[in-house]
C-alpha cells in the first residue's frame, strides 16, 4: 500500500507512517514503528502538557513568585498549568498575571475618572475632544486644551487626546 501523506486526528506522520499522539499529561518517549505503538510517559510532579502532543519534554508549571505579590489561585495538574493571582488588594498586570500592581494607571490619551480605593481599581476614561493627557497617571484627569484665543494667539498645531494645541502669533497684515 501507498505510504500515507496525512493522518487521522490525534495522530502524526513520521517515517511514512501514522503514529498516535501522546495524550495530555504525557510526553513522547519513542515514536511508533511498524511493530510497536507510540511510547508515552506521564509528566513529572511539577510538569504538564495540555494538548495531544509529540513533545519530548513536559512544560514546567508556572511559579507564582510571592516576591512579585503572586499566589496560587489553582494548582497545576499533569494536564493544566498553575494559575497565579495577586495578593488581596493587588491587581494582575495582564491576563497571564505575571506581576502585581496596587492599582492600574491611565495611559496617555486617558484620564482618571475615579481614583482607586481599597476595594476598587482606578477607572480610566478616554480624553474627549478638547482635552488631552500626555502622561501615565493614577490621579490626573484629562486637561483641557490651551485656549489660544484668550492669549491673543492662533492655533498653529491642533491638539489630540495625547497632546495640547500649539499656539503661535497671529499673522500681521503688511501695509
Amino acid at each position: 500500500p501507498e505510504p500515507p501523506t496525512a493522518c487521522r486526528e490525534k495522530q502524526y506522520l513520521i517515517n511514512s507512517q501514522c503514529c498516535s499522539l501522546c495524550q495530555p499529561g504525557q510526553k513522547l518517549v519513542s515514536d511508533c514503528t511498524e511493530f510497536t505503538e507510540t511510547e508515552c510517559l506521564p509528566c513529572g510532579e511539577s510538569e504538564f502538557l495540555d494538548t495531544w502532543n509529540r513533545e519530548t519534554h513536559c512544560h514546567q508549571h508556572k511559579y507564582c513568585d510571592p516576591n512579585l505579590g503572586l499566589r496560587v489561585q489553582q494548582k497545576g495538574t499533569s494536564e493544566t498549568d498553575t494559575i497565579c493571582t495577586c495578593e488581596e488588594g493587588w491587581h494582575c498586570t495582564s491576563e497571564a498575571c505575571e506581576s502585581c500592581v496596587l492599582h492600574r494607571s491611565c495611559s496617555p490619551g486617558f484620564g482618571v475618572k475615579q481614583i482607586a480605593t481599597g476595594v476598587s481599581d482606578t477607572i480610566c476614561e478616554p480624553c474627549p475632544v478638547g482635552f488631552f493627557s500626555n502622561v501615565s497617571s493614577a490621579f490626573e484627569k484629562c486637561h483641557p486644551w490651551t485656549s489660544c484665543e484668550t492669549k491673543d494667539l492662533v492655533v498653529q498645531q491642533a491638539g489630540t487626546n495625547k497632546t495640547d494645541v500649539v499656539c503661535g502669533p497671529q499673522d500681521r497684515l503688511r501695509a
Epitope: T93, L102, S105
Partner: nanobody, 116 residues
C-alpha cells in the same frame, strides 16, 4: 534595581508634626508620578497623597486634606510628606511608591505612631 527607602517615622503626640522622606534610586526619579500609601494595623492599604513628575499637580485623600503636604526634590531624588495636626487614626506604616506600583518595587515603609 528600583529602591525606595522611607524614613522619618516615629512616635508623636496628637496634634504634633512629622516629616517623612523617601530616597529613591535605580530609576529616573524625575520621570515618575510618586505616591504615599499607608497601612494601619489590621487594615488595607490607603492611598494618601500623590504628586506628578515635576511637582505641579498633587492629590490628597479626604482624610488628610489640609493637614498633609506632599513635595519632591528631583535634584535629590527624594519625595517628602509633611504631616501636621496628626491624629490617632494617622497611625500606620507609610510607604512611598512609584508608578506603576509594582509589588516588588515597594520599600519597607516607616512606622508613624500617634499617641499620648
Amino acid at each position: 534595581e528600583v529602591q525606595l527607602l522611607e524614613s522619618g517615622g516615629g512616635l508623636v503626640q496628637p496634634g504634633g508634626s512629622l516629616r517623612l522622606s523617601c530616597a529613591a534610586s535605580g530609576f529616573t526619579f524625575r520621570d515618575y508620578e510618586m505616591w504615599w500609601v499607608r497601612q494601619a494595623p489590621g487594615k488595607g492599604l490607603e492611598r494618601v497623597s500623590a504628586i506628578n513628575p515635576w511637582g505641579g499637580l498633587t492629590y490628597y485623600a479626604d482624610s488628610v486634606k489640609g493637614r498633609f503636604t506632599i513635595s519632591r526634590d528631583n535634584s535629590k531624588n527624594t519625595l517628602y510628606l509633611q504631616m501636621n495636626s496628626l491624629r490617632a487614626e494617622d497611625t500606620a506604616v507609610y510607604y512611598c511608591a512609584k508608578l506603576p506600583f509594582y509589588f516588588h518595587e515597594w520599600g519597607q515603609g516607616t512606622l508613624v505612631t500617634v499617641s499620648s
